[in-house]
Interface confidence: medium
């Protein structure tokens, strides 16, 4: 629930679709120019946990375009440049909206929908389970 | 551009608004249900480059809660437990998409705008600049 | 733990000002939104006014819109309260209010758990 | 504005019984509904928040249930402290409104 004070200049809406559907102007209010993550940073080559980004590409979605991270290894480099399988290189995960076409094919309707992205990958140190 | 094959049964759409408004459904599909990133995993603690997560609020945005990472530490957590400063932790930023209410207050008109989050923290080697 | 502390109440004549002021410890003032909630002697809760935590988002009941202003210091963890052209129907306590701290769900914390003690003010000829 | 009624506006009861108290919204809040315990000369203090959610240090004979325009606050066995006035707030959409308030008095 999302508290919201009510301006008179809103759009109407019946109850019958409202909070459901809304309007909204695809136009985007962009703060950040670059959007290419591989441009953006170098992390993803130079972190101890690197990563590879693969394009993930819907046209059903929006955006139809999302990168996703891979990490390299199992573990993590140490600093002769090694794989050191004492560490482990894990995704950093978040959950992002995207907007699906619905019903499919359909350019100016849409539903959100929430998936889990991997963004890059950090190093940790494991769990390790004692055996009895 | 996404060649968008039309289904019939679309919502039809007025030129003037097309394409820039549309029509969406905010019943989110989701196929995660875990929405609080200090449950998620416990990565941010495990991590050589451990984060804390801070809470971005605003009524205004959907979603209107955003969790934020914040490193730790400037260095990167050594096999002793110590930070070493040889190393640096740094943010993994990703682009996400938010919907803003415009104009202000509405419950049910959106414009999408997209914002740079910091979502977890990652180790990487520093570059060095050599001075000639 | 947190602390709210309210001052600045009193008597005053109607088409009066006055400025009321809280003080906040035991938290990260500047996360939180923050309000101001009054009660007319004898009488029920009423909602006056909300700020956000950067202080550039501002709400007020219709009836206090233009005569009263929210506003905050978050360098001093203070909330204020201007009240300008007073009316015998303002004379309330007048309570400062925060959100939950603890809490991590995904709605807005924009409930009221801290409450001051009140400072009363009173609109009077 | 949303409307917040409250029912009864006072109810008189001895130590032990099981208090409901009701609170109807004119239109939906969907879950957005607080409640609050608020004695003589004090500040109110928050009891319930978003409908069924107990506040720290709130004892566990204090329940809420309901949803969109329906809410109840239970008192299963009412102690000789609960004596006080209790109001249901709404912050699902400004002005954020309350209820009028039931009083709870002891038989």
């Known amino acids: 629930g999302i508290t919201i004070p009510r301006n008179p200049g809103c759009p109407n809406s019946e109850d019958k679709n409202f909070p459901r559907t809304v309007m909204v102007n695809l136009n985007i209010h962009n703060r950040n120019t670059n959007t290419n993550p591989k441009r953006s940073s170098d992390y993803y080559n130079r972190s101890t946990s690197p990563w590879n980004l693969h394009r993930n590409e819907d046209p059903e979605r929006y955006p139809s375009v999302i990168w996703e991270a891979k990490c390299r290894h199992l573990g993590c480099i140490n600093a002769d440049g090694n794989v050191d399988y004492h560490m482990n290189s894990v995704p950093i995960q978040q959950e992002i909206l995207v907007l699906r076409r619905e019903p499919p094919h359909c350019p100016n309707s849409f539903r959100l929908e929430k998936i889990l992205v991997s963004v890059g990958c950090t190093c940790v140190t494991p769990i390790v389970h004692h055996v009895a | 551009g996404i060649t968008i094959p039309r289904n019939p049964g679309c919502p039809n759409s007025e030129d003037k608004n097309f394409p820039r408004t549309v029509m969406v459904n905010l019943n989110i599909h989701n196929r995660n249900t875990n929405t609080n990133p200090k449950r998620s995993s416990d990565y941010y603690n495990r991590s050589t480059s451990p984060w804390n997560l801070h809470r971005n609020e605003d009524p205004e945005r959907y979603p209107s809660v955003i969790w934020e990472a914040k490193c730790r530490h400037l260095g990167c957590i050594n096999a002793d437990g110590n930070v070493d400063y040889h190393m640096n932790s740094v943010p993994i930023q990703q682009e996400i998409l938010v919907l803003r209410r415009e104009p202000p207050h509405c419950p049910n008109s959106f414009r999408l705008e997209k914002i740079l989050v910091s979502v977890g923290c990652t180790c990487v080697t520093p570059i060095v600049h050599h001075v000639a | 733990e947190v602390q709210l502390v309210e001052s600045g109440g009193g008597l005053v004549q109607p088409g009066g000002s006055l400025r009321l002021s809280c003080a906040a410890s035991g938290f990260r003032f500047s996360d939180y939104y923050m309000a101001w909630v009054r009660q007319a002697p004898g009488k029920g809760l009423e909602w006056v006014a909300t700020i956000s935590g950067s202080g550039g988002t501002t709400y007020y009941r219709d009836s206090v819109k233009g005569r009263f202003t929210i506003s905050r210091d978050n360098a001093k963890n203070s909330l204020y309260l201007q009240m300008n052209s007073l009316r015998a129907e303002d004379t309330a306590v007048y309570y400062c209010?925060?959100?939950?701290?603890?809490?991590?769900?995904?709605?807005?914390?924009?409930?009221?758990?801290?409450w001051g003690q009140g400072t009363l003010v009173t609109v009077s000829s | 504005d949303i409307q917040l009624t409250q029912s009864p506006s006072s109810l008189s009861a001895s130590v032990g019984d099981r208090v409901t108290i009701t609170c109807r919204a004119d239109?939906?809040?969907?879950?957005?509904m607080h409640w609050y315990q608020q004695k003589p000369g004090k500040a109110p203090k928050l009891l319930i928040y978003l409908v069924s959610n107990s506040e720290i240090g709130v004892p566990d004979r204090f329940s809420g249930s309901g949803s969109g325009t329906d809410f109840r606050l239970t008192i299963s066995s009412l102690q000789p402290e609960d004596f006080a006035t209790y109001y249901c707030?709404?912050?699902?959409?400004?002005?954020?409104?309350f209820g009028q308030g039931t009083k709870v008095e002891i038989k």
């Open positions: 239109e939906s809040v969907r879950t957005l």
């Open positions: 707030l709404q912050t699902h959409s400004y002005p954020y409104t």
């Open positions: 209010a925060s959100p939950p701290q603890y809490y991590e769900g995904s709605i807005p914390r924009l409930w009221f758990a801290h």
